[in-house]
């Protein structure tokens, strides 16, 4: 039975040029994480294995940096960067678990960050 | 350099039994999910069996399930196929491959044959 | 189970040709397609992964596009080298499954 949650960084918004981290938290669940993988809409951004470590996907190596933890950062951020991007946690014995957050990129130098999780 | 080295292939009879060996060296063969793929003459590419590397997770294509055994031994560097009850449609060439990340499939065997045939 | 279906099963082309391979997937599976070159007795190459990742060593004219259902895998300038049997394989779910081939011989 699949107990976990998942907790995002939600709805976020950050300015062009500017870059933003991505991050979600699996809790609730005492099941080995295996995996875990960062999507743009049906494309591959990483891969973080447990035992692997990170594979950043080659046409996004300039602009993307793993971390922090198990989080992603997005460099050099343009307006198409806008959209839903998905973590999906690989686990052990539960399966697999996806949390979605929304990216907003600005123009203009206001961008508010969500507030439902705190990044340190 | 990676390289992966079947063997244990040959002539079996039908309903005969055949283990097959995938020795393994170059990288740090417990960290690796492993597959085996067969391809008939003259035929494409069949999935088999595969072996995660970090739970032991195991599944079956439905043609092989119940028949053959996928196994590895991370000590030895080695993964296993062992085929029970073997029909003349298992006659292919099977390859060993390894699949990081759960994904693709970066690096295969040369392959050894397996003929079925009384 | 899915079933992934490639077209044209053959195709002849001549050296410097741009050559197109479809796949296509009996459902979404997202970008989870891969790309793989055989020659006779030889084992299966990779080329591309997941969907339009070119793997590392694989010359830059192979290219690979797609999502969803309907993937492409193109050959910019074909070169002597690159007649082969072509595969796509879907890792969205076990089992996984290769499409039938494409093989690309000389005109």
């Known amino acids: 039975m699949m107990t976990g949650t998942i907790e995002t960084t939600g709805n976020i918004s950050a300015e062009k040029g500017g870059s933003i981290i991505l991050q979600c938290h699996l809790s609730s669940t005492t099941a080995q994480v295996t995996q875990v993988n960062w999507e743009q809409q049906d494309q591959l951004l990483a891969i973080c294995n447990a035992d692997l470590g990170w594979h950043i996907s080659p046409s996004f190596k300039d602009r993307v940096a793993p971390g922090p933890g198990l989080g992603l950062t997005l460099q050099s951020l343009t307006v198409n960067d806008t959209g839903e991007y998905f973590c999906i946690y690989h686990t052990y014995p539960d399966g697999t678990y996806t949390g979605r957050i929304f990216l907003e990129v600005l123009e203009s130098s206001v961008a508010e960050h969500g507030a439902r999780f705190q990044i340190p | 350099e990676v390289q992966l080295l079947e063997s244990g292939g040959g002539l079996v009879q039908p309903g005969g039994s055949l283990r097959l060996s995938c020795a393994a060296s170059?990288?740090?063969?417990?960290?690796?999910?492993m597959n085996w793929v067969r391809q008939a003459p003259g035929k494409g590419l069949e999935w088999v069996a595969a072996?995660?590397?970090?739970?032991?997770?195991?599944s079956y294509a439905d043609s092989v399930k119940g028949r053959f055994t996928i196994s590895r031994d991370n000590s030895k560097n080695t993964l296993y196929l062992q085929m029970n009850s073997l029909r003349a449609e298992d006659t292919a060439v099977y390859y060993c491959a390894r699949e990081p990340y759960g994904v693709w499939m970066d690096y295969w065997g040369q392959g050894t044959l397996v003929t079925v045939s009384s | 189970d899915i079933q992934m279906t490639q077209s044209p099963s053959s195709l002849s082309a001549s050296v410097g040709d741009r050559v197109t391979i479809t796949c296509r997937a009996s459902?979404?599976?997202?970008?989870?397609l891969n790309w793989y070159q055989q020659k006779p007795g030889k084992a299966p190459k990779l080329l591309i992964y997941?969907?339009?990742s070119l793997q590392s060593g694989v010359p830059s004219r192979f290219s690979g596009s797609g999502s969803g259902t309907d993937f492409t895998l193109t050959i910019s300038s074909l070169q002597p080298e690159d007649f082969a049997t072509y595969y796509c394989?879907?890792?969205?779910?076990?089992?996984?499954?290769f499409g039938g081939g494409t093989k690309v011989e000389i005109k």
């Open positions: 459902q979404s599976i997202s970008y989870y």
């Open positions: 072996i995660s590397g970090s739970t032991g997770t195991i």
């Open positions: 394989q879907q890792s969205y779910s076990t089992p996984l499954t």
């Open positions: 997941a969907a339009s």
């Open positions: 170059g990288f740090t063969f417990s960290s690796y999910s």
